[in-house]
């Protein structure tokens, strides 16, 4: 015998109190598949969460985070605060990047400045907390009468401090 509830489409539920008639989901609830015996309560996007997509009878609401926060977790289950450029988020809040490191985004960690000398280049623009250094031509290229042939880059050695 076929289950009469299997005929109930998404957006309805099989109402046992009414001889298994397919009843529409009540307000603020949904069923995303057919044959459901109950409808699920819609997610509410409150506080630091804001509504990205309204709940409908066939699909749950979707949340994202208010400005100043970004989503974490499946389906944006959590909101993590943004930091300013030049900072990183630590367990105790936003902290400025240490000297020699930078972060050009509102999330993530501070990264060391590029070490230009590892590629045989000079520093063209100094780094800041918000920006990496800009490497220029190699010192040899800047000397008068220098050959246009770029010398091979030295082998990378571990442990060089950023410059």
């Amino acid at each position: 015998l076929q289950d009469p509830c299997s005929n109930c489409p998404a957006g309805t539920f099989c109402d046992n109190n009414r001889n298994q008639i397919c009843s529409p989901c009540p307000p603020n609830s949904f069923s995303s598949a057919g044959g459901q015996r109950t409808c699920d309560i819609c997610r509410q996007c409150k506080g630091v969460f804001r509504t990205r997509k309204e709940c409908s009878s066939t699909s749950n609401a979707e949340c994202d985070c208010t400005p100043g926060f970004h989503c974490l977790g499946a389906g944006c289950s959590m909101c993590e605060q943004d930091c300013k450029q030049g900072q990183e988020l630590t367990k105790k809040g936003c902290k400025d990047c240490c000297f020699g490191t930078f972060n050009d985004q509102k999330r993530g960690i501070c990264r060391p400045w590029t070490n230009c000398s590892l590629d045989g280049k000079s520093v063209l623009v100094n780094g800041t907390k918000e920006r990496d250094v800009v490497c220029g031509p190699s010192p040899a290229d800047l000397s008068p009468g220098a050959s246009s042939v770029t010398p091979p880059a030295p082998a990378r050695e571990p442990g060089h401090s950023p410059q």
């Epitope: 988020l89 630590t90 367990k91 105790k92 960690i109």
Partner: nanobody
Framework: EVQLLESGGGLVQPGGSLRLSCAAS????????MTWVRQAPGKGLEWVSS????????YYADSVKGRFTISRDNSKNTLYLQMNSLRAEDTAVYYC?????????????????WGQGTTVTVSS
Amino acid sequence: EVQLLESGGGLVQPGGSLRLSCAASGFTFSNYAMTWVRQAPGKGLEWVSSISGSGDSTYYADSVKGRFTISRDNSKNTLYLQMNSLRAEDTAVYYCAKEGTGTTSDYYYNVDVWGQGTTVTVSS
């Protein structure tokens, strides 16, 4: 598949206690530091406490120091958070999280897996 499942949340009166548990599966539990993080209504994530893989190093947010105790039982693949002297401001969804290495600190977030969370409500 790595999974973290929190339990133990509920409604408690101010000054009361609760113990949260986090059952871990899908990875070698003792090799990784673990962290509790919470999200109060209308607020962003707040780090609560972290413990190293071996359990010998623990760290706490100033807001919970002296009231909360983090611990782990590596033989049961379970993380705990004992919460005493609870206050209204401790009301939040509490998430258990796996860090990426065995060591931890009170500085970097190094979280790569989150649980689904358990709700703690402190109210009279």
